[in-house]
């Protein structure tokens, strides 16, 4: 019995289509594959950013795979051919590994790249990113921002920069159609007549950096002799009610009485008849049902009642 062997895939490579971190891994079938024509050959692909402790592992019948990477670091990948046991009348046969790497040749020293990059998706409508120039760069240094997400044909450059002293220090993005719940890739590169500038790459999902508007229309309603219902409305805009968490801060007679986090637009407060003043503010945040993370809104305008017995009437401001 001759031992069954299979070759590794050919021409295993990582291809950068210019999407700022979304890369293609592709390969060709091994030589002599048609010996196993009646058999479905699979490929085991392992890949990671250099420096990462864990490999991502994929088993596929395809000749390509796509994923996002951090281009601030290098990428390494390896692949081998798998012949399932059904093809070999016994145990699974594996080829040797084919390996490849990819990295963007860095220009400039790390200190020249932008500092303190911060991106906020205001009210799930308007994306704004801001940064500080690199350390020790001259005023002739200018930074340019490019972005891509799946659905765009190619990476786009910012067309509305925020400037300070003639330097780009931020970008106001246009309307970004169908851009949430997918990786959003940004590259900020730079140019200077004096010295090369290091590029920076960032990846996030827009729904995770949403800062909503604060809630509106705060009201009080007396529910019983010792209960007051606080109510408010969801902020204006595209975010549905089911996506909000709220934090309430309630002050009774200048003393913080309660800080609470709730999922609905109401909160019932136990009070005493001695209460002379009641104030509350609310802020909103996108909840775990709609995102993995988020940014608290500013606090709402304060809604207060003072000078009358709270038990006498419904309070509306």
């Amino acid at each position: 019995d001759t031992e069954i062997k299979v070759n590794p895939p050919q021409d295993f490579e990582i291809v950068d289509p210019g999407y700022l971190g979304y890369l293609y891994l592709q390969w060709q079938p091994p030589l002599s594959l048609d010996h196993f024509k009646e058999c479905t050959v699979e490929y085991e692909l392992k890949y990671r950013n250099i420096g990462s402790e864990t490999w991502k592992t994929i088993i596929t019948k395809n000749l390509h795979y796509k994923d996002g990477f951090d281009l601030n670091k290098g990428i390494e990948a390896k692949i081998h051919t798998l012949l399932p046991w059904q093809c070999t009348n016994g145990s699974e046969v594996q080829s040797s590994w084919a390996e490849t790497t990819y990295w963007i040749s860095p220009q400039g020293i790390p200190e020249t790249k932008v500092q303190d990059m911060d991106c906020v998706y205001y009210n799930w409508q308007y994306l704004l990113c801001s940064w500080k120039p690199g350390i020790g760069v001259l005023l002739d240094t200018n930074y340019n921002l490019f972005y891509w997400y799946e659905g765009l044909d190619h990476a786009l450059q910012c067309v509305d920069y925020i400037k300070a002293d003639g330097q780009n220090i931020g970008c106001r993005f246009p309307y970004l159609e169908a851009s949430d719940y997918k990786d959003f890739y940004i590259c900020v590169n730079g140019s200077s007549e004096n010295k090369p500038i290091r590029s920076s790459y960032f990846t996030f999902q827009l729904q995770n950096i949403v800062k909503p508007l604060p809630p509106v229309y705060l009201t009080f309603t007396r529910e019983s002799s010792c209960e007051i219902k606080l109510k408010w409305s969801i902020p204006l805009g595209p975010i549905p009610a089911r996506c909000f968490d709220y934090e309430i801060e309630i002050r009774e007679d200048d003393t913080t009485l309660v800080t609470a986090t709730v999922e609905n637009e109401t909160y019932t407060l136990k009070t005493t008849n001695e209460t002379r003043q009641l104030c509350f503010v609310v802020r909103s945040k996108v909840n775990i049902y709609c995102s993995d993370d988020g940014i608290w809104s500013e606090w709402s305008d304060k809604q207060c009642w003072e000078g009358e017995d709270l038990s006498k009437k419904t309070l509306l401001r």
Epitope: Q10, D11, E13, I14, V15, P17, Y24, Q26, Q28, P29, L31, S32, L33, D34, H35, L63, H64, T100
Partner: antibody, heavy 118, light 107 residues
Framework: EVKLVESGGGLVKPGGSLKLSCAAS????????MSWVRQTPEKRLEWVAT????????YYPDSVKGRFTISRDNARNNLYLQMNSLRSEDTALYYC???????????WGQGTSVTVSS | DIVMTQSQKFMSTSVGDRVSVTCKAS??????VAWYQQKPGQSPKALIY???YRYSGVPDRFTGSGSGTDFTLTISNVQSEDLAEFFC?????????FGGGTKLEIK
């Protein structure tokens, strides 16, 4: 329909340079390796160069290594062959061919003629 | 380099006949051989890959066989449009190499 159209051939003196182009259409260009193959006046076929789909791998026979460079522009679906230090034995009809998944060549262009003569 | 030898430069046959074109590799190339047909004034067309598998659209009159060092392209029921030159090619290792070609003449 897969289509490969070569251009850039012509008459050049020994020692001169020429750049051939191949415009590809009808398939996902970046997923396929591409080759240049030439046919001599005696009708012999000679492999000249191969490049992988992403351009990371290039292969040449010793006869052209160091003189010819294969490259590709996947954004424009174009394949190129830069030929330097041309010799009379480089005279041939140059074909651009798509490499299939087995490394054979499943589609060929119509060819562009290169004549190296003083 | 692997040398691919097509010992018959010319073959003469008649319409309806069966003809075999042979190709010998100077070393083992497993099944990594392709066959091409080049009609007069045209570019080569792929017929067979992996020694015995027809490309789609190729008539089943064309059959490839062999492995290792000896390969055969058989054309059964030869047609007048089969007037062409046939080339074998190995892609088992670089440099890729072609046979010298076999011209099929129709009587």
């Amino acid at each position: 329909e897969v289509k490969l159209v070569e251009s850039g051939g012509g008459l050049v003196k020994p020692g001169g340079s020429l750049k051939l182009s191949c415009a590809a259409s009808g398939f996902t260009f970046s997923s396929y390796g591409m080759s240049w193959v030439r046919q001599t006046p005696e009708k012999r076929l000679e492999w000249v160069a191969t490049i992988s789909g992403g351009g990371s791998y290039t292969y040449y026979p010793d006869s052209v290594k160091g003189r010819f460079t294969i490259s590709r522009d996947n954004a424009r679906n174009n394949l190129y062959l830069q030929m330097n230090s041309l010799r009379s034995e480089d005279t041939a009809l140059y074909y651009c061919a798509r490499r299939d998944l087995r490394s054979a060549m499943d589609y060929w262009g119509q060819g562009t003629s290169v004549t190296v003569s003083s | 380099d692997i040398v691919m030898t097509q010992s018959q430069k010319f073959m003469s046959t008649s319409v309806g006949d069966r003809v075999s074109v042979t190709c010998k590799a100077s070393q083992n190339v497993d099944i990594n051989v392709a066959w091409y047909q080049q009609k007069p004034g045209q570019s080569p067309k792929a017929l067979i890959y992996s020694a015995s598998y027809r490309y789609s659209g190729v008539p089943d009159r064309f059959t490839g066989s062999g492995s290792g060092t000896d390969f055969t392209l058989t054309i059964s029921n030869v047609q007048s449009e089969d007037l062409a030159e046939f080339f074998c090619q190995q892609y088992n290792s670089y440099p890729l190499t072609f046979g010298g070609g076999t011209k099929l003449e129709i009587k």
